[in-house]
């Protein structure tokens, strides 16, 4: 069964800078990746980025840079809002559309007691949806 993993990482050099890493574990080719926060895409979440393997990437504030890390994983850097701990306790969701499997989505957040530079390990998928 395909699986999606999500890691949220606070950068050691900039305490106000966060990076979301997402990956797809499974066969098939990825046609689109959507990253949202505050909930799943289309279910109360706000879109942060869309990444297409050929047509490029699209990002919305406060996303700073969305990019492919491998053919099946992406990263999204977020800029500080000026608020204290701006992205703590915030849920980030990644949705991978792949062929022929369909769409798979998982969500994660920064662990409550994260040290700078550490990230959440790839956890069991809390939200897993095949469309």
């Amino acid at each position: 069964t395909p699986e999606v993993w999500v890691q949220v990482q606070m950068e050691a050099t900039e305490l106000s800078s966060f990076t979301v890493h997402c990956g797809f574990l499974g066969p098939g080719s990825i046609s689109l990746v959507t990253v949202s926060w505050g909930g799943p895409d289309g279910a109360g979440g706000t879109k942060l980025a869309v990444l297409h393997p050929e047509l490029g990437t699209r990002q919305w504030a406060p996303a700073r840079q969305a990019r492919w890390e491998t053919q099946s994983s992406i990263s999204l850097a977020l800029e500080d809002s000026g608020a204290s701990s701006p992205f703590a306790n915030t849920t980030f969701c990644c949705k991978f559309a792949s062929f022929p499997e369909g769409s798979w989505e998982s969500c994660g957040s920064l662990p409550p007691s994260s040290d700078p530079g550490l990230s959440a390990p790839p956890t069991p998928v809390p939200i897993l949806r095949a469309d």
């Epitope: 869309v50 047509l55 699209r58 990002q59 919305w60 504030a61 809002s81 000026g82 608020a83 992205f87």
Partner: antibody
Framework: EVQLQQSGAELAKPGASVKLSCTVS????????IHWVKQRPEQGLEWIGG????????VSASKFQDKATITADTSSSTAYMQLSSLTSGDTAVYYC????????????????WGQGTSVTVSS | DIVLTQSPASLAVSLGQRATISCRAS??????????MHWYQQKPGQPPKLLIY???NLESGVPARFSGSGSGTDFTLNIHPVEEEDAATYYC?????????FGGGTKLEIK
């Protein structure tokens, strides 16, 4: 200079369809979303939907999903919206608008608007 | 859908005074310090014009007498000092989730 030029006024009969156009200049249509907004006479604004011309993704409000079809032709820098099965409730001014973009980041707000296309549905 | 309620529906303000327009959302439109609320001005026969984006950011070319504030569910647009050319209808719009919705509008008259 950023501009969105919309097609002219339409007079249509109930049950008919119309296709509105929005031709952009002063920026690359692939760099941002183009949205469509409805404004009935003396009333407020309603978001219909939008399109990402680079990727071809469309998003729309559920109440307009069977009413409006949004497309784009990047070669002519034009976005289109087709309204089908017209009724008197579709009589309105329809605006296209560009989503605000800066340094490759979008902001979910609409910073440049077309002049509007008036659609009148009458038998 | 998130409902935006603007108040007052209309107001009359003397030249040079402050105009305050409120917008209340039926649920929070903020996440971690980011507020997905925007303000527009519309004059008769013209399309809307973006004034403020993300609650408090002044759009390029908009006079500094316009300012936005708020977070969560309560937002405010302030105009001070009000000028004759500010007579218009003002709309708030959220983009916290799909579909984005607009407030009902506030008509500002200059006395």
């Amino acid at each position: 200079e950023v501009q969105l030029q919309q097609s002219g006024a339409e007079l249509a009969k109930p049950g008919a369809s119309v296709k509105l156009s929005c031709t952009v200049s002063g920026f690359n249509i692939k760099d941002t979303y183009i949205h469509w907004v409805k404004q009935r006479p003396e009333q407020g604004l309603e978001w219909i939907g939008g399109i990402d011309p680079a990727i071809g993704n469309t998003v729309s409000a559920s109440k307009f999903q069977d009413k409006a079809t949004i497309t784009a032709d990047t070669s002519s820098s034009t976005a289109y919206m087709q309204l089908s099965s017209l009724t008197s409730g579709d009589t309105a001014v329809y605006y296209c608008a560009r989503e605000r973009v800066h340094s490759n980041t979008l902001y979910y707000a609409m910073d440049y608007w077309g002049q509007g296309t008036s659609v009148t549905v009458s038998s | 859908d998130i409902v935006l309620t603007q108040s007052p529906a209309s107001l009359a303000v003397s030249l040079g005074q402050r105009a305050t327009i409120s917008c209340r959302a039926s649920k929070s439109v903020s996440i971690s310090g980011y507020s997905y609320m925007h303000w527009y001005q519309q004059k008769p026969g013209q399309p809307p014009k973006l004034l403020i984006y993300l609650a408090s950011n002044l759009e390029s070319g908009v006079p500094a007498r316009f300012s936005g504030s708020g977070s969560g569910t309560d937002f405010t647009l302030n105009i001070h000092p009000v000028e004759e050319e500010d007579a218009a209808t003002y709309y708030c719009q959220h983009s916290r989730e799909l579909p984005p919705t607009f407030g009902g509008g506030t008509k500002l008259e200059i006395k």
